[in-house]
């Protein structure tokens, strides 16, 4: 579809004859009937196939032709047409002369022709005007003409159909040769597509307006690139959705579980080195002169019993000293100036004479001890508990606290590490030499039986098209990340269908 | 139940520098932002930026580049604002506030109490 | 920066409904959501989320609150206004960056 458009730009008919040669009374009043048809190599009489055209009188003898409306016609002249261009025409101007005012061919005498021209050619579609003159031995006619689409058809011959949108079915202009133009945030081949925000993920995130970024389930973000990890993750992130991978030091399900009691803690008292030794458990090396679980008790030099034959112990600032009773000195009261003579030996007690009577020996009955038999027996100095255990005297007795991990009288025994039950889901424990071992129970696997592999929630292809999709391992269900123009629990709707999502 | 509890008043000087805390509890906290409101009589409500809890991300409004650092420390539940060279244009009461970011949508469902920060030599 | 603008103040008899607006200074919606949110904040107290993407109700908010509007245009409704709701009300977007709030519009009572 498109336009044969003619403007007439000067007439001369200087003498103001017809083509008879006859002059017209008063002058020649002169109005034009235009002719488009198909191209003929000569051009006859014959049907306008590409339509007619009559102007008003436009003047009289010779006149200049305005460019705009004149008399209640139009110039440039239009000659419509509803097909395709086909790049050649004929094209026939006649100027008549009007003595009265009805124009019609039928109420004009057949000698009221002023002059005829014919022309024929090629003619492309295009906005620039091919100026022509045709010159008779009386009249002369300068003109100019073009082809020109109509609103909304483009191309070579005005064949392609274009029409600006900006709604649902599309977001464009067109171009001149009806290709479609997108307006700015916009894309894909109608221009229905929207330019999401600039970053927005390709795969986790789409929009359904320019700028926009909305977030497949499991993302989450400015720009939906970060997954929301397992509800519940404590001390841990995820790569995809629903992930919890434990920070250094955290471990389970939820990375709730302290590995790492000692950095978190410090349990150790008194510059102790602590050392970890399974969840919330720990050990501390005392620094000399430290004691206790923690190592929160300051040990007294004392409690070594230092001094011999029944010297008392005082503790110092920089050490401890013996007192010394009658008859010994020394630094540990060790030298002795007594012989058996003296009666040195305590709590029944049998004296030897040694080195000629220079000195002597004590044997000592049971439950005593020390050079003249003056000591109770410590038990505990043998240091009979195993494992770091910590000897305690109890009157009569002794007794062993152990250390995590340990038990029996002299903490002998190594505490069964399955009796804490640490094999989650049902998972039978096994006791091994330095630690322990899970068996799972099948769908659960991990050093604790902690990872959940059973039910495959995607094994039914639950997401519609071609969506990919991910199991939620704390229950057992699956999540959908839709492709592009998809929404929906299940990929199941097209965008231009909203879902309500549950945030 | 979601609870935000930020640290108390300050006091502070011209050139100074401010740290104030917001402690979480009450749901998964490293799946989360937390976002940080300035408000004053002035110029209302203007948000200063977000901080992913999981991550450390930051975003932060142009306005407020050069002047709010925030951090986080996930073993404490507790996020951070550091607000430094202060002026008096500074004193406001600032809010920390959980917040919900999916592509174009934000808002912020809990808010903590808010800090009175005044700036005055 | 978007521009969101609400009027100061709303005089308003216990028990009518009551209509705050907020307007903003570019479109805040796609064909799928608006990006705008509303907030009541109650004297010497933090904000409140009422309203999120123009109209889906906060947990916990009395269906008296509702939310409307698309495009430039937008609406919090309170009906019936009670007492407890006597507040400033800001609304938020969230279409543009920086994220910005309106100057919050005090409702008073008549």
């Known amino acids: 579809s498109g336009v044969f458009q003619l403007q007439l730009q000067e007439f001369i008919n200087e003498r103001g004859v017809l083509a008879s040669g006859r002059p017209c009374e008063p002058g020649c009043r002169t109005f034009f009937r235009v002719c488009l048809k198909h191209f003929q190599a000569v051009v006859s009489p014959g049907p306008c196939t590409f339509g007619t055209v009559s102007t008003p009188v436009l003047g009289t003898n010779s006149f200049a032709v305005r460019d705009d409306s004149s008399g209640g016609g139009r110039n440039p002249l239009q000659l419509p047409f509803n097909f395709t261009w086909p790049g050649t025409f004929s094209l026939i101007i006649e100027a008549w002369h009007a003595p009265g005012d009805d124009l019609r061919p039928e109420a004009l005498p057949p000698d009221a022709l002023i002059s005829k021209i014919a022309i024929q050619g090629s003619l492309a579609v295009g906005q620039n005007w091919l100026l022509d003159e045709q010159t008779s031995t009386l009249t002369r006619l300068r003109y100019s003409y073009r082809v020109i689409c109509s609103d909304n058809y483009y191309g070579d011959n005005c064949s392609r159909l274009c029409k600006k949108r900006n709604d649902h079915f599309g977001h464009y202009v067109c171009q001149p040769d009806g290709n479609l133009s997108c307006l700015p945030g916009w894309t894909g081949e109608y221009c229905q597509q929207p330019i999401c925000l600039s970053g927005c993920h390709e795969q986790n995130g789409y929009c359904s307006k320019p700028a926009e970024c909305l977030c497949r389930p499991g993302w989450q973000g400015r720009l939906c690139n970060e997954c929301i990890p397992h509800n519940g993750c404590r001390h841990g992130t995820c790569s995809t959705p629903w992930q919890c991978t434990c920070d250094e030091g955290w471990g389970g399900l939820f990375c709730d579980q302290d590995l790492n009691y000692c950095t978190h803690h410090s349990p150790c008292k008194n510059g102790a080195t602590c050392s970890n030794s399974g969840q919330r458990s720990y050990t501390c090396t005392c620094r000399p002169g430290y004691t206790g679980v923690d190592c929160e008790l300051e040990l007294s030099e004392c409690d070594s019993n230092p001094c011999r034959n029944g010297g008392s112990c005082k503790d110092q600032e920089d050490g401890y000293h013996c007192l010394c009773p009658p008859g010994y000195y020394g630094l540990h009261c060790e030298h002795s100036t007594l012989s058996c003579a003296d009666s040195p030996c305590f709590n029944g007690g049998s004296c030897r004479e040694r080195n000629q009577g220079a000195n002597y020996a004590c044997e000592c009955p049971p439950n005593f001890t020390g050079s003249n038999c003056e000591k109770k027996v410590d038990r505990c100095t043998s240091n009979p508990c195993a494992n770091g255990g910590q000897c305690l005297n109890r009157g009569p007795s002794r007794m062993c606290r152990c250390r995590p991990g340990f038990t029996g009288t002299y903490c002998e025994l190594h505490v069964s590490d399955c009796a804490r039950n640490p094999c989650a889901h049902g998972g039978t424990c096994h006791d091994l030499e330095n630690g322990l071992m899970c068996t799972c129970p099948a769908g659960f696997s991990g050093r604790r039986c902690e990872v959940r592999t059973s039910i495959d929630a995607c094994a039914s292809s639950p997401c519609f098209n071609r969506a990919t999709c991910y199991t939620d391992l704390s229950t057992d269900t699956f999540v959908c990340n839709c492709p592009y123009g998809f929404v929906g629990s299940r990929c199941e709707f097209p965008v231009g269908l909203p879902p309500s999502f549950p945030w | 139940e979601v609870q935000l509890q930020q640290s108390g008043p300050e006091l502070a000087k011209p050139g100074s520098s401010v740290k104030i805390s917001c402690k979480a509890s009450?749901?998964?906290?490293?799946?989360?932002?937390i976002s940080w409101i300035k408000q004053t009589t002035g110029q209302g409500l203007e948000y200063i930026g977000y901080?992913?809890?999981?991550?450390?991300?930051?975003d932060y409004n142009e306005k407020f580049k050069d002047k709010a650092t925030l951090t986080v420390d996930k073993s404490s539940r507790t996020v951070f604002m550091q607000l430094s060279s202060l002026t008096p244009g500074d004193s406001a009461v600032y809010y920390c506030?959980?917040?919900?970011?999916?592509?174009?949508?934000?808002?912020?469902?809990?808010w903590g109490q808010g800090v009175m920060v005044t700036v005055s030599s | 920066d978007t521009v969101l603008t609400q009027s100061p103040a709303l005089a308003v008899s216990l028990g009518q409904r009551v209509t705050i607006s907020c307007k903003a200074s570019?479109?805040?919606?796609?064909?799928?959501?608006?990006?705008i949110y509303w907030y009541q904040q109650k004297l010497g107290q933090q904000p409140r989320l009422l309203i999120y993407?123009?109209?889906t109700l906060a947990s916990g908010v009395p269906a008296r609150f509702s939310g409307s509007g698309s495009g430039t245009d937008f609406t919090l409704n309170i009906d019936p206004v009670e007492a407890d709701d006597i507040a400033t009300y800001f609304c938020q977007q969230s279409w543009s960056d920086p994220f910005t709030f309106g100057s919050g519009t005090k409702l008073e009572i008549k």
């Open positions: 009450g749901y998964t906290f490293t799946s989360s932002y």
């Open positions: 993407r123009a109209s």
């Open positions: 506030a959980k917040s919900i970011l999916l592509g174009s949508t934000y808002y912020l469902d809990y």
């Open positions: 901080i992913n809890t999981g991550s450390g991300g930051t």
């Open positions: 570019r479109s805040l919606s796609s064909p799928m959501y608006s990006y």
